[in-house]
Amino acid sequence: MMTGTIETTGNISAEKGGSIILQCHLSSTTAQVTQVNWEQQDQLLAICNADLGWHISPSFKDRVAPGPGLGLTLQSLTVNDTGEYFCIYHTYPDGTYTGRIFLEVLESSVAEHGARFQIP
């Protein structure tokens, strides 16, 4: 039975031209994390595999940095980066856990971080 929960940074905002850390955390399970995918609805940004290390999609190589930890740093943000981002944790023996982050990239300097929330 899958007992874990994914905690994410939830709804977040950042300024155009700045950077943001996308972070998920898996808790309440002893399952082993073997891979984490970072994706948009129709595009894979990055994969962190326990054996193979990090893979960054060529389309994002210039603007995406691995880490911290299993998170992902997006740099040189544009308004087009606004949207949903998903972390997909591959675990053994539980299977996959997924979390959602919504990023809003703002033109002005009124960006604030949203509250953390959990997805069961």
Partner: antibody, heavy 121, light 107 residues
Amino acid sequence: QVQLVQSGAEVKKPGASVKVSCKASGYAFTNYLIEWVRQAPGQGLEWIGVINPGSGGTNYNEKFKGRATITADKSTSTAYMELSSLRSEDTAVYFCARRGDKYGSAWFAYWGQGTTVTVSS
Amino acid sequence: DIQMTQSPSSLSASVGDRVTITCRASQDVSTAVAWYQQKPGKAPKLLIYSASFLYSGVPSRFSGSGSGTDFTLTISSLQPEDFATYYCQQHYSSPRTFGQGTKVEIK
């Protein structure tokens, strides 16, 4: 349990349109993306496009852009794929499929039974 | 678009045999490959996702491996119900693309 039930077989004339439905049950319809895939007789699988039933957002294979329209009706938990300007090469079995996880990667864990569309004059 | 090339296109094997099917991507797709089994007149069934993760309920005789451009589906001991066509699919980028299929027939 998760089920995707598709509409029945269709026979169409070249130039006509066809609309295939896919009724979902056993899960929260708006939480999972629905994909459409087709398979011509004796051939492999070809991805047509995807819809997010929650937002209505779509993405299409460039090959089908302008001819395929994917929609979803939240009130009936039904996704639709309409293909216009039909030609004989569109004769195929059309499948709807659902991703395995909420927000998950594009591997397809649940499939409809398929709808045969025959285009013939 | 990313092309997925499977080999062989067909093979003959006996019950109990170890069977290996390969899939090559036209560019690096990391581990974003799934494998499906399809029987005549039926919808495909998911076997493996993310190159090596066995989907829930799939027998452990099926396994997947590979990363980058080269991927393998292995059936450790072929069972009568495994005679079918197998497809690889990349879930790395849009449009999603499939291999042309490998038909596993009875020898």
